[in-house]
């Protein structure tokens, strides 16, 4: 399942305005827009399961649906790793697995999926509504993170189905995964859009969000993400009561959420940055890891010259370049 832009239905142009050529130039941008948003966008899915035998024992399974090669997986709880979350395990495809309490056993299930069993006793044991996050660092897509928790009504031994959590493209590195033709198409799209600024706008069906909002959902952030843009990260309450999201501005958005670091909001980004995302199953939510916060000049592994992706949790020498770059 890919993240698709919800392209609004186009009204036919008024007679004499643009004619057949105008209609074609109107349709083409939306086709290209959809392509730009969907092509090569990977996904991370998270499944949280409470074991029937031990009521406070959890199994977290995560997978990466993308064509790139995974360079590291980090599992955390209580929120995204590095944003207040507690690191539970780090899995490197070639350097092995490291885990910390209450993680009991982390392992690779396949080349693109992992599982983690959590201990069920002690002060640090998880509770039913704890949020678990999996962050996949991959090449060339960059860093992708999804989070999930046990649905509130879950019976022991049951689990939420492994919901693919569509992650918004958050890395410049993703460009590498898109063909030159597509890149050209996106440039052409921008050119067309610029030209359309000087023409009467075609009538679009009103958006459900608000009459003033940009019509293409691909360009319009949800209320939730708009609110989240005012803070570096939405903060997750890690205590054992229903998790709440503290944002600068309360909003009536859906129960799932996507947030970008503040500095990402000011970065020029293509339409993919606001691709509309289907609502995941109850009890799980989507988080976006921007991946553009590596210090200037750092060279994470497998990247081309001068292309920065994300800090490499395998070890800081991976950021030194050329030494330590794997």
């Amino acid at each position: 399942m890919r993240t698709e832009a919800q392209v609004p239905a186009l009204q036919p142009p008024e007679p004499g305005l643009e004619g057949a050529m105008g209609h074609r130039t109107l349709v083409l941008p939306w086709v290209l827009l959809t392509l730009c948003v969907t092509a090569g966008t990977p996904e991370v899915w998270v499944q949280v399961r409470m074991e029937a035998t031990e009521l406070s024992s959890f199994t977290i399974r995560c997978g990466f649906l993308g064509s790139g090669s995974i360079s590291l997986v980090t599992v955390s709880w209580g929120g995204p790793n590095g944003a207040g979350g507690t690191t539970l395990a780090v899995l490197h495809p070639e350097r092995g697995i490291r885990q910390w309490a209450p993680a009991r056993q982390a392992r690779w299930e396949t080349q693109s999926s992992i599982s983690l069993i959590l201990e069920g006793s002690g002060a640090s044991s998880p509770c039913a509504n704890t949020t678990f996050c999996c962050k996949f660092a991959s090449f060339p897509e960059g860093s992708w993170e999804a989070c999930g928790s046990l649905p509130p009504s879950s019976d022991p031994g049951l689990s939420a189905p492994p919901t693919p959590a569509p992650i918004l493209r958050a890395d410049l590195a993703g460009i590498l995964g898109v063909s030159g033709v597509l890149l050209f198409g996106c440039v052409y799209l921008l050119h067309l859009l610029r030209r359309h600024k000087h023409r009467p706008a075609p009538r679009l069906q009103p958006s459900r969000t608000s009459p003033q909002a940009p019509r293409a959902r691909a360009w319009a952030p949800s209320q939730a993400s708009q609110a989240a843009l005012h803070v570096p990260y939405a903060t997750i309450n890690t205590s054992c009561r229903p998790a709440t999201l503290d944002t600068a501005h309360p909003h009536g958005g859906p129960s799932w959420w996507a947030s970008l670091p503040t500095h990402a909001a000011h970065r020029p980004q293509g339409p993919a940055a606001w691709a509309s995302t289907p609502i995941p199953a109850r009890g799980s939510f989507v988080s976006v890891e921007n991946g553009l916060y590596a210090q200037a000049g750092e060279r994470p592994p497998h990247t081309g010259p001068g292309l920065t992706l994300f800090p490499d949790p395998r070890g800081p020498r991976a950021m030194e370049g050329p030494l330590g770059v794997r």
Partner: antibody, heavy 114, light 113 residues
Framework: EVQLQQSGPELVKPGASVKISCKAS????????MNWVRQSHGKSLEWIGD????????NYNQKFKGKATLTVGKSSSTAYMELRSLTSEDSAVYYC???????WGTGTTVTVSS | DIVMTQSPSSLSVSAGEKVTMSCKSS????????????LAWYQQKPGQPPKLLIY???TRESGVPDRFTGSGSGTDFTLTISSVQAEDLAVYYC?????????FGGGTKLEIK
């Protein structure tokens, strides 16, 4: 430049305790876990344990449980290891190493002697 | 615990010669999930901390000369130096990256004639 600067050599009496430090610089301390390794004179390397600054619950080699205690000071980007009930067997060079042993500290020589 | 056994314990060669050293583990270091071998090699020169050379049994750490090659799978691994240089004088350790506790071999000391 990524560096792990360890505290200076220690000369301690048997039965005493010592706390050695490893100050990290050149990277975000909380992004990487820290290992501690012992190397007795002219001998091989022994992994003592590891700790992630974002977790705080260390893993220990069973051999060093009760002997070593690992902690971190996030604000100072420093990892600590306390060794207690020292004997002459504990005389060694102690290294800290980040992540998957990618970068190693300068080493701290601990000598236990009466 | 996984026991790592290295051989020979020392060897002396002339510059330009090819050298191979062995490392055997008491349990397989092959991860069944992703079919990777979790073994690393380190070089420790006199008075210095160890330095990572090879990880994943055969992947050379960036900046490591291509004369160093790691090979092997399961329980038997080899480090080869195709043409020994004077600066390669060091002790070489293999390490189990597969399961806690991480264990190191006894080392192979390389001397240059």
């Amino acid at each position: 430049e990524v560096q792990l600067q360890q505290s200076g050599p220690e000369l301690v009496k048997p039965g005493a305790s010592v706390k050695i430090s490893c100050k990290a610089s050149g990277y975000t301390f909380t992004d990487y876990f820290m290992n501690w390794v012992r190397q007795s004179h002219g001998k091989s390397l022994e992994w003592i344990g590891d700790i992630h600054p974002n977790n705080g619950s260390p893993n220990y080699n069973q051999k060093f449980k009760g002997k070593a205690t690992l902690t971190v000071g996030k604000s100072s980007s420093t990892a600590y290891m306390e060794l207690r009930s020292l004997t002459s067997e504990d005389s060694a060079v102690y290294y800290c190493a980040t992540g998957y042993f990618d970068v190693w500290g300068t080493g701290t020589t601990v000598t236990v002697s009466s | 615990d996984i026991v790592m056994t290295q051989s020979p314990s020392s060897l002396s060669v002339s510059a330009g010669e090819k050298v191979t050293m062995s490392c055997k583990s008491s349990q397989s270091l092959l991860n069944s999930g992703n079919q990777k071998n979790y073994l690393a090699w380190y070089q420790q020169k006199p008075g210095q901390p160890p330095k990572l050379l090879i990880y994943g049994a055969s992947t050379r750490e960036s900046g490591v000369p291509d004369r160093f090659t790691g090979s092997g799978s399961g329980t038997d691994f080899t480090l080869t130096i195709s043409s020994v240089q004077a600066e390669d004088l060091a002790v070489y350790y293999c390490q189990n990256d597969h399961s806690y506790p991480w264990t190191f071999g006894g080392g192979t000391k390389l001397e240059i004639k």
